[in-house]
């Protein structure tokens, strides 16, 4: 007795397609071993037609596939364009040879059933309408015209020319003639349902001289389109319902036994399970729209249906489109935190995954807004300037090649709480959703800048200090100058005539940035932050205003010549710690590659460092350095 299970008998008709599901026991070996579909010959040999190793026989070319669903312990063989030659005995099985575990399946493909010779076949989709053409002889022009539906015993009236209408066709059936043509009448039936399928007879006149025509109306449910998506990825349902429903409300629902639960519609309804990760986008005036769901979960798998109706809810007899969504748990998309927590005044660093094969793609970050149909306006991108209201507090750091980019948002307020999406202009499956929660701060921030009201004087030296706690002792500290194109990390060394530097005071764990001399271009936002390798941590921001020295004032330069010499000396110490190897430029520099990671003087273990020059618009540059402070007890 084989542990493989499937349909023992499958029957279909020529031209149709079948989906044969085979079930296998839940073991790791079974999930990963070869799956096959073979045809049994008279000799008892079973000839492979298709296998999960990629083999496809000539007779199945272009019309069959085999898909494994390891999470369901099933695999499915889909065969299209069936002919009577496909009738026969088959096996679905597992194993490296066709003598492994298997199950016998008998497939019978029969001819399309014969209808009376004069039968006209109309094939329509559910929810659509049909116009049945009924020809008659001129002598029956004055006679009654009718359409009836055949039942087992009789023919039940649908509509006739005396305006009699069957109750189940009221408002849906119309009998009419076109122009002056007195040899044909028409019956239009709208909002077709499965119950409308069957044989009809249209008739003009009575008795033996009556004109009759047989009609076979086939009402088809749309075949669900199969969608295979990875866990945590995104899916787009493209719904094309036709111009006749262009002005109706649209919806997407998920089948739940006998009902279809609306997930989203254009009237503002949205299932809370999809909060922050769904958008509905009307495409055009032809009834087309799309629904995008990001951050796919295992429980999102299922049977989906889109449709249109003024109520925004599923209604029988209205056009629909369907999908079967499978969510593969063996995902290529890394498992990241879906909720990030911050505090007011603080900062968050959000790591956004992208397809590592598309390192040159443009990266974006948008904020999901649920009003209306939902939308996600871009706040920042690799080539998109930061939105004005986020000035000085939002930046995107692209780390080419490692499959992650980082978005940092600081000066948080409770208004920042909500859902954000990471997306690129490349592989759309890699759209991910982050929920940002912002709580009221209950303690001082980890990073603090002094002075807090920073006004630098043109031509002088200006120093700001960033205080950090001992827990950031082993992390790299950096200063960067924010612009709406990003936050350019200041290089740790510059021997240009204009000197600026960052130094670290041993006793009080601080990293300082000195602008020397201050120029007008120095005005703007600066961030102090910590990072470990490519992982960014907390940041804090300060705005430095630059003003001219008021004439005649006896302004005292904050750093005298001795202090300036001291800074230079400290820089020399920093420089002496950079080995030849560490001075190599970053390969394949991206927009933020002009970053010199901060040197930690006093560290016993030298970490691998990279450097590069960050030129500002006028060719001047800023520099930053940092030291670890060892406390001896």
């Amino acid at each position: 007795k084989s542990p493989i299970f499937g349909p023992q008998e499958v029957s279909s008709i020529e031209g149709d397609s079948v989906s044969i599901t085979c079930y296998y026991p839940d073991t790791s070996v079974n999930r990963h071993t070869r799956k096959y579909w073979c045809r049994q010959g008279a000799s008892g040999m079973c000839t492979t037609l298709i296998s999960s190793n990629g083999y496809l026989s000539k007779e199945y070319s272009g019309r069959a596939n085999l898909i494994n669903f390891p999470e369901n312990n099933t695999f499915v063989i889909n065969i299209e364009q069936l002919t009577q030659d496909d009738t026969g005995s088959y096996k679905c099985g597992l194993g490296t040879s066709n003598r492994g575990l298997s199950f016998d399946v008998s497939l019978e493909v029969s001819q399309v059933p014969e209808l009376p010779s004069d039968t006209h076949v109309y094939t329509k989709d559910i929810g659509r309408n049909v116009t049945i053409e009924c020809p008659f002889k001129r002598e029956n022009a004055p006679s009654k015209k009718s359409l009836c539906k055949k039942t087992n015993q009789s023919c039940e009236l649908v509509i006739d020319s005396t305006e009699k209408v069957n109750p189940s066709y009221i408002g849906r059936a119309k009998l009419f003639m076109k122009g002056t043509d007195l040899t044909v009448f028409y019956v239009n039936i709208s909002h077709l349902t499965h119950n409308d399928a069957g044989l009809y007879i249209c008739q003009a006149g009575e008795g033996p001289s009556a004109d009759k025509k047989n009609v076979d109306l086939q009402v088809l449910a749309p075949e669900p389109e199969l969608l295979y998506k990875d866990l945590r990825s995104s899916v787009t349902f493209e719904c094309d319902l036709g111009r006749e429903v262009a002005n109706e409300a649209k919806y997407l629902c998920r089948m739940n036994k006998e009902t279809c639960d609306v997930i989203i519609n254009t009237l503002g309804k949205r299932d809370p399970d999809f909060e922050g990760r769904i958008l509905i986008t009307p495409k055009d005036d032809n009834g087309r729209f799309s629904v995008l769901i990001t951050g796919l979960r295992k429980e999102d798998a299922g049977h989906y249906q889109c449709g249109a109706h003024s109520s925004g809810l599923p209604q029988e007899g209205w056009p629909i489109q369907t999908w079967q969504l499978f969510v593969n748990e063996e995902s290529t998309i890394p498992n990241r935190r879906s909720v990030v927590k911050g505090v007011t005044g603080g900062s968050v660093a959000i790591a956004c995954p992208y397809n590592p094969k598309e390192s040159s793609s443009l990266k974006y970050w948008c904020r999901w807004e649920g009003d209306g149909n939902g939308h996600c306006p871009v706040l920042v991108g690799t080539q998109a300037q930061v939105q004005e209201e986020y000035e000085g507090r939002l930046a995107l750091f692209d780390q080419p090649g490692n499959g992650t980019y980082t978005v940092i948002l600081n000066q948080l307020t409770t208004e920042d709480a909500g859902f954000y999406w990471c997306l690129t202009n490349g592989d759309s499956r890699w759209r991910t959703t982050i929920e940002l929660q912002v709580a009221e701060a209950t303690r001082e921030p980890n990073l603090e800048v002094t002075p807090q009201n920073a006004t630098a004087v043109l031509g002088e030296t200006f120093t700001v200090s960033c205080h950090y706690p001992c827990k950031f002792y082993s992390q790299e500290k950096y200063w960067c100058k924010w612009s709406n194109k990003g936050c350019h990390i200041l290089p740790s060394h510059d021997e240009g005539a204009r000197q600026s530097s960052v130094s670290c005071d041993q006793s009080s764990q601080l990293v300082s940035m000195t602008l020397n001399p201050v120029s007008k271009e120095d005005e703007g936002w600066y961030w102090c932050g910590v990072k470990q390798g490519q992982t960014y941590g907390e940041t804090t921001a300060i705005y430095i205003a630059v003003e001219e020295r008021t004439r005649g004032s006896s302004h005292v330069n904050p750093t005298d010549a001795n202090a300036r010499a001291k800074v230079a000396l400290e820089e020399e110490v920093v420089d002496s710690s950079i080995s030849e190897k560490e001075n190599k430029a970053i390969p394949n520099p991206g927009p933020f590659a002009n970053e010199r990671e901060i040197q930690n003087v006093g560290d016993q273990a030298q970490e691998n460092r990279a450097s590069g020059d960050a030129g500002s618009a006028d060719g001047q540059s800023r520099s930053s350095s940092s030291k670890h402070h060892h406390h001896h007890h």
């Epitope: 279909s12 008709i13 079930y23 499965h194 009402v219 075949e223 006998e258 499978f326």
Partner: nanobody, 129 residues
Framework: EVQLVESGGGLVQAGGSLRLSCAAS????????MGWFRQAPGKEREFVAA??????????YYAESVKGRFAISRDNAKTTAYLQMGSLNPEDTALYYC????????????????????WGQGTLVTVSS
């Protein structure tokens, strides 16, 4: 709401045959599944056979223990399923339940009761030796 009513059960001698019917009312399915399960006294409910249809396709599933002896079918009006049982033996004695659903995800094991939403009350089949 769909109602399922089983009929055709009764007492039969070993080696004999019976034909069970399951009539569905309340709604017709353009695609769907109807199955038969059975439960012998003191035992768990077990799968017997199922028939699934969609468009012009029909898929018939059987439990190993009834293969070659039982045959499942349905009428074209899509409202009644039949289970033709032959070569009956005392181990076939049980309460036979009919179950149905609009096409469930065909990636769920149809031998489990879970995919079936609608159930009948059952009809008793007793096979005497």
């Amino acid at each position: 709401e769909v109602q399922l009513v089983e009929s055709g059960g009764g007492l039969v001698q070993a080696g004999g045959s019976l034909r069970l019917s399951c009539a569905a009312s309340g709604r017709t399915f353009s695609s769907g599944i109807m199955g038969w399960f059975r439960q012998a006294p003191g035992k768990e409910r077990e799968f017997v056979a199922a028939i699934e249809w969609s468009g012009g396709n029909t898929y018939k599933y059987y439990a190993e223990s009834v293969k070659g002896r039982f045959a499942i079918s349905r009428d074209n009006a899509k409202t009644t399923a039949y289970l033709q049982m032959g070569s009956l033996n005392p181990e076939d004695t049980a309460l036979y339940y009919c179950a149905a659903d609009e096409s469930p995800s065909r990636y769920i094991d149809l031998r489990r009761p879970a995919p079936y939403h609608y159930w009948g009350q059952g009809t008793l089949v007793t096979v005497s030796s």
